[in-house]
Interface confidence: low
Amino acid sequence: EIDPCHSQPCFHGGTCEATAGSPLGFICHCPKGFEGPTCSHRAPSCGFHHCHHGGLCLPSPKPGFPPRCACLSGYGGPDCLTPPAPKGCGPPSPCLYNGSCSETTGLGGPGFRCSCPHSSPGPRCQKPGAKGCEGRSGDGACDAGCSGPGGNWDGGDCSLGVPDPWKGCPSHSRCWLLFRDGQCHPQCDSEECLFDGYDCETPPACTPAYDQYCHDHFHNGHCEKGCNTAECGWDGGDCRPEDGDPEWGPSLALLVVLSPPALDQQLFALARVLSLTLRVGLWVRKDRDGRDMVYPYPGARAEEKLGGTRDPTYQERAAPQTQPLGKETDSLSAGFVVVMGVDLSRCGPDHPASRCPWDPGLLLRFLAAMAAVGALEPLLPGPLLAVHPHAGTAPPANQL
């Protein structure tokens, strides 16, 4: 009889126990910090905090706060138990506290706009000062019911850590209510007001005749002139000018949840959808060894790229990542920091026809605004949890 433990199927020092009751014929007893049928998945210690529906548990970006869930498939809430919200006006209506809902058409499919009473001014008529919100602001987890401009979008938790993406935009214009609703509001079509979420742009999207072609030729190293437009994502930066050393120009480090078995496809989707959404050329950067700058999170390299500080207690809770990135894990989802190059050469005052964020900080504000109004997550292959803009410097070799 073959011993199922003979092949040493348990990674990271897990101990194997043969058992007829298991589908694999064995059970791995995993050391602290790892989980999955073969102990190959890094497991942040979440204590009693469980993430449902495939959600990933991640350490809080803020020391001293509990871990949080990055939810998938539209689920929400602290444990990913909140069912996905319907598209458009529902039912149930996404507008709380007797707000009235009107359907809109935006780039991400059916959307909605709430007309709210003065007492509840959030995008979904939330009450940022509502009971129970005081202790939740800035805890690293987005509490949608506490998100609105009055509460700094739950202390930045619902806006990628940016307390006020519309800072500098006149408050009386209420552009945060009109952002990316599919209609042009000229009073919001400015840098300070984040170009009304590009609702005033024409054409709003890459023409269908070009879209598939541009998809197939996105960031392939060759400039496709027909794809070198804002609405087609600037060909993923393939047509950027060659002056200077643009490969190590400005970049964004994104903390995103992706599925390791389909990582390449999802990285491609992430780069293209962000290029189209932000109307700038974006691509996954490569290090000097020619490897994608994609780092498992949590991990020292990932956190270095994010520019954040590691929770000092976290090192004791989870074993370090020792697995090469290419190895598929048992997990359906995992955290990664993806460093993306950005071509901003078509943006700025010298290119008035192309409204787009002309520096990485403005890009971050735009992404934060999209996150704040719930327009970002439906477009991406997985939840985007944090963004850190970088000025241009040559990266060190990837040591993974």
Partner: antibody
Framework: EVQLVESGGGLVQPGGSLRLSCAAS????????MSWVRQAPGKGLEYVST????????YYANSVKGRFTISRDNSKNTLYLQMGSLRAEDMAVYYC????????WGQGTLVTVSS | EIVMTQSPATLSVSPGERATLSCKAS??????VAWYQQKPGQAPRLLIY???TRHTGIPARFSGSGSGTEFTLTISSLQSEDFAVYFC?????????FGQGTKVEIK
Amino acid sequence: EVQLVESGGGLVQPGGSLRLSCAASGFTFSSYGMSWVRQAPGKGLEYVSTINSNGGRTYYANSVKGRFTISRDNSKNTLYLQMGSLRAEDMAVYYCARDQGFAYWGQGTLVTVSS
Amino acid sequence: EIVMTQSPATLSVSPGERATLSCKASQDVGTAVAWYQQKPGQAPRLLIYWASTRHTGIPARFSGSGSGTEFTLTISSLQSEDFAVYFCQQYSSYPWTFGQGTKVEIK
């Protein structure tokens, strides 16, 4: 069509054990959390236990914690409830149900605890 | 654990009339509340989830409302097939819990 079929109920003495099974079909079993809910004769519904989609997380009502164990075999599309140290108050019809909004239920299996 | 309290225990209503069932949670459960209908000898049937979303195939006469700690199931015009026991359930936090039920009977 979603179907959940419970089995394994029967008569057991106090202190005894029993294993219930729930065979699922008509949906991707491995994608859904599953639960057990029970109903004593003439009484209301009582939540018993939940297991997440991959079997990595389990939850129990306080009344059964330490005595009952929920598990699943995704390769067989089957949910289990191992019940031990059974008491008279555990006598009920046991239903398996899908996810947290229990949209789909089995027909139930009766567990009788009596000496 | 969160206690769900339903009232009244029994509701006597004539066919065609409106029935209003109440469910109170011992602490804030947001809108993570479901309502079920159960008839003798049958498994429960999901009517409403997410406090106010009607499940597929549920007639429009059933509606749910509320958030936080107070929830209501309304049957706008009772039909003969609606006389049954109704349970509320919270799935905001573990262990999930049910109310004790409200029996809707013919007046």
